[in-house]
């Protein structure tokens, strides 16, 4: 036990508990496939502890490996609607800085009306995540149907 | 390093490693859309470390932000079955106390036979989570097809 | 505060930050339904911190409860392709040691081209996880469409 005490101790603030859960604010203007997000206790159950929003896009404040997760549900959608409007695709990626631009997560709706997934990925301070929805169907703004979040996991 | 040692240290028990992974026990009686869960090492790979089960529903014991995840697979299902029995919907929410009742996560099956998703959400000690399955198809009780869990992430 | 200081402290290395995110390397030879994974910074955004790869399969190095997640997208796939080649199923399980062999997570594609899910499960040092894809459609090797990972959550 004494040996354990002698090892490097972990201060609370170094745990890097950066975490955010966002709800959909609005879609972009014509030619802009990005979804614009919002978060904060005044809005319901969304929050930002560490990361920040920059014009509706999520900006990372701490280097590390993150669990990124997303669910997007298409509004006024049935399997026939979804197949009729195919292809509808959701991609999550680093969109800035441009030098680090990469797609992290991509899903197509096919005959479904909801996509949901998650992955672990290294992110660096200053990385901005964008969520691009291509297709002609609107995403639902219901907070239990469409959401996007990140959780810092380790350095 | 000495400075780090002087910062607030994190005791093991304050890490809040509350976590639970449940398997389906049974569906509710007529007019009760709730799924009833069970967990514990005697049942296989399900467990409760912190949260408790209250009549098959998951009750939270520690305030914090949680990752909630779920997968539900419909039994004896094909894409034609699923579309024939549409709409089948799964919703995860806080069902008690009534003052905090809210839907956290909602998905429809459309032409699929499995839904799976996850989200971050603040939960408080005493919150009870309910999983409501509406529709006429039974959920699979196979432990690798239907499960529900929470993981404490941060205060 | 003094009381908190007196409690058991948590050394950094005992946090068990074991984590891995893998990308698809290749599919198995005839009669071998396993997917073979690869990871490492030279390959892009995949990594192994703790777990190891053993002939393309993920081997656990630390006992604990893990969050296991996976996404697999079928290549050259549409909802008609997917239904044409049904059943296509993905199962994640412990495949060795044989005494601990069990299916942890199972999903069918039905009319979809992507499956994604996650679950909490206890894993022990030496457990090897296999991902079996049954069916006649190739999985996409795009790193944002097909990936597999684990994250240590608690002892």
């Amino acid at each position: 036990q004494r040996f354990a005490q002698a090892q490097q101790q972990l201060p609370l603030e170094s745990l890097g508990w950066d975490v955010a859960e966002l709800q959909l604010n609005h879609t972009g203007p014509q030619q802009d496939p990005r979804l614009y997000w919002q978060g904060g206790p005044a809005l319901g159950r969304s929050f930002l502890h560490g990361p920040e929003l920059d014009k509706g896009q999520l900006r990372i404040h701490r280097d590390g490996i993150y669990m990124v997760h997303i669910q997007v549900t298409l509004a006024i959608c049935s399997s026939t609607t979804a197949s009729r409007h195919h292809p509808t695709t959701l991609a999550v990626g680093i969109c800035s800085p441009a030098s680090r631009s990469i797609s992290l997560l991509r899903l197509s709706f096919h005959q479904g009306c909801t996509i949901a997934s998650q992955r672990l990925t290294p992110l660096a301070r200053g990385d901005t995540l964008c969520t691009n929805l291509t297709g002609t169907l609107l995403p639902s703004r219901n907070t239990d149907e469409t959401f996007f979040g990140v959780q810092w996991v380790r350095p | 390093q000495r400075f780090a040692q002087a910062q607030q240290q994190l005791p093991l028990e304050s890490l809040g490693w509350d976590v639970a992974e449940l398997q389906l026990n049974h569906t509710g009686p007529q007019q009760d859309p709730r799924l009833y869960w069970q967990g514990g090492p005697a049942l296989g790979r399900s467990f409760l470390h912190g949260p408790e089960l209250d009549k098959g529903q998951l009750r939270i014991h520690r305030d914090g932000i949680y990752m909630v995840h779920i997968q539900v697979t419909l039994a004896i299902c094909s894409s034609t079955t699923a579309s024939r029995h549409h709409p089948t919907t799964l919703a995860v929410g806080i069902c008690s106390p009534a003052s905090r009742s809210i839907s956290l996560l909602r998905l429809s099956f459309h032409q699929g036979c499995t839904i799976a998703s996850q989200r971050l959400t603040p939960l408080a000690r005493g919150d009870t989570l309910c999983t409501n399955l509406t529709g006429t198809l039974l959920p699979s009780r196979n432990t690798d097809e239907t499960f529900f869990g929470v993981q404490w992430v941060r205060p | 505060q003094r009381f908190a200081q007196a409690q058991q402290q948590l050394p950094l290395e005992s946090l068990g930050w074991d984590v891995a995110e893998l990308q698809l390397n290749h599919t198995g030879p005839q009669q071998d339904p396993r997917l073979y994974w690869q990871g490492g910074p030279a390959l892009g955004r995949s990594f192994l911190h703790g777990p190891e790869l053993d002939k393309g399969q993920l081997r656990i190095h630390r006992d604990g409860i893990y969050m296991v997640h996976i996404q697999v997208t079928l290549a050259i796939c549409s909802s008609t392709t997917a239904s044409r080649h049904h059943p296509t199923t993905l199962a994640v399980g412990i495949c060795s040691p044989a005494s601990r062999s069990i299916s942890l997570l199972r999903l069918s594609f039905h009319q979809g081209c992507t499956i994604a899910s996650q679950r909490l499960t206890p894993l022990a040092r030496g457990d090897t996880l296999c991902t079996n894809l049954t069916g006649t459609l190739l999985p996409s090797r795009n790193t944002d469409e097909t990936f597999f990972g684990v994250q240590w959550v608690r002892p």
Epitope: - | - | L24, T27, Q30, T73, A75, I76, R84, H85, T136, S140
Partner: antibody, heavy 118, light 111 residues
Framework: QVQLKQSGPGLVQPSQSLSITCTVS????????VHWVRQSPGKGLEWLGV???????DYNAAFISRLSISKDNSKSQVFFKMNSLQANDTAIYYC????????????WGQGTLVTVSA | DIVLTQSPASLAVSLGQRATISCRAS??????????MHWYQQKPGQPPKLLIY???NLESGVPARFSGSGSGTDFTLNIHPVEEEDAATYSC?????????FGGGTKLEIK
């Protein structure tokens, strides 16, 4: 091991129909699809159509109006029928299948030489 | 439909030398981390035999002197060193989309 055996007539009258049966062994028709390919004299190979494991079919657009592929899973048989044959349909007709993954032909029938002539 | 153009239509190669056959697709057959191009060998009176799948994977039981390469629209089958038994017609085939199509074939003669 996987085998495909074809049976059918060698000579067909112009405007008549061609029927070939492909009997498979070593795999189940509920798991794998069976394709049909032909090779005209001195010409390359031509993909005609496929019956998938679930029973649905896809045809080369050039033949869709006169081609029909069906199967009997319990008998492990696939049936190929082409109507309104003309002299330029003279060819060797093959059934073929894949293993593990769909996209390339690992196993072929022995071929049926079909001559369209009065 | 994707058109596959093989060249040359025929070639004669000395025993032990290298034979190179090209196949060009009218549009890319590469996607999702794979190149959906395959190669077959056919001898008179026999059905085609699979040599290479997904552009570069050697089919089980096929000698290592056969190799495939390429991506996008341009693909190559190499045979080195050529042996007597390699005299045959070689065809490429894509499976990027339906209808799957074949190249016109290349007849290899051993000098």
């Amino acid at each position: 091991q996987v085998q495909l055996k074809q049976s059918g007539p060698g000579l067909v009258q112009p405007s008549q129909s061609l029927s070939i049966t492909c009997t498979v062994s070593g795999f189940s028709l509920t798991s794998y699809g069976v394709h049909w390919v032909r090779q005209s004299p001195g010409k390359g190979l031509e993909w005609l159509g496929v019956i998938w494991s679930g029973g649905s079919t896809d045809y080369n657009a050039a033949f869709i109006s006169r081609l029909s592929i069906s199967k009997d899973n319990s008998k492990s048989q696939v049936f190929f029928k082409m109507n309104s044959l003309q002299a330029n349909d003279t060819a060797i007709y093959y059934c073929a299948t894949y293993y593990r993954y769909d996209g390339w032909f690992a196993y072929w029938g022995q071929g049926t030489l079909v001559t369209v002539s009065a | 439909d994707i058109v596959l153009t093989q060249s040359p239509a025929s070639l004669a190669v000395s025993l032990g030398q290298r034979a190179t056959i090209s196949c060009r697709a009218s549009k890319s057959v590469s996607t999702s981390g794979y190149s959906y191009m395959h190669w077959y060998q056919q001898k008179p009176g026999q059905p085609p035999k699979l040599l290479i799948y997904l552009a570069s994977n050697l089919e089980s039981g096929v000698p290592a002197r056969f190799s495939g390469s390429g991506s996008g629209t341009d693909f190559t089958l190499n045979i080195h060193p050529v042996e007597e038994e390699d005299a045959a017609t070689y065809s490429c085939q894509h499976s990027r989309e339906l209808p799957w199509t074949f190249g016109g074939g290349t007849k290899l003669e051993i000098k």
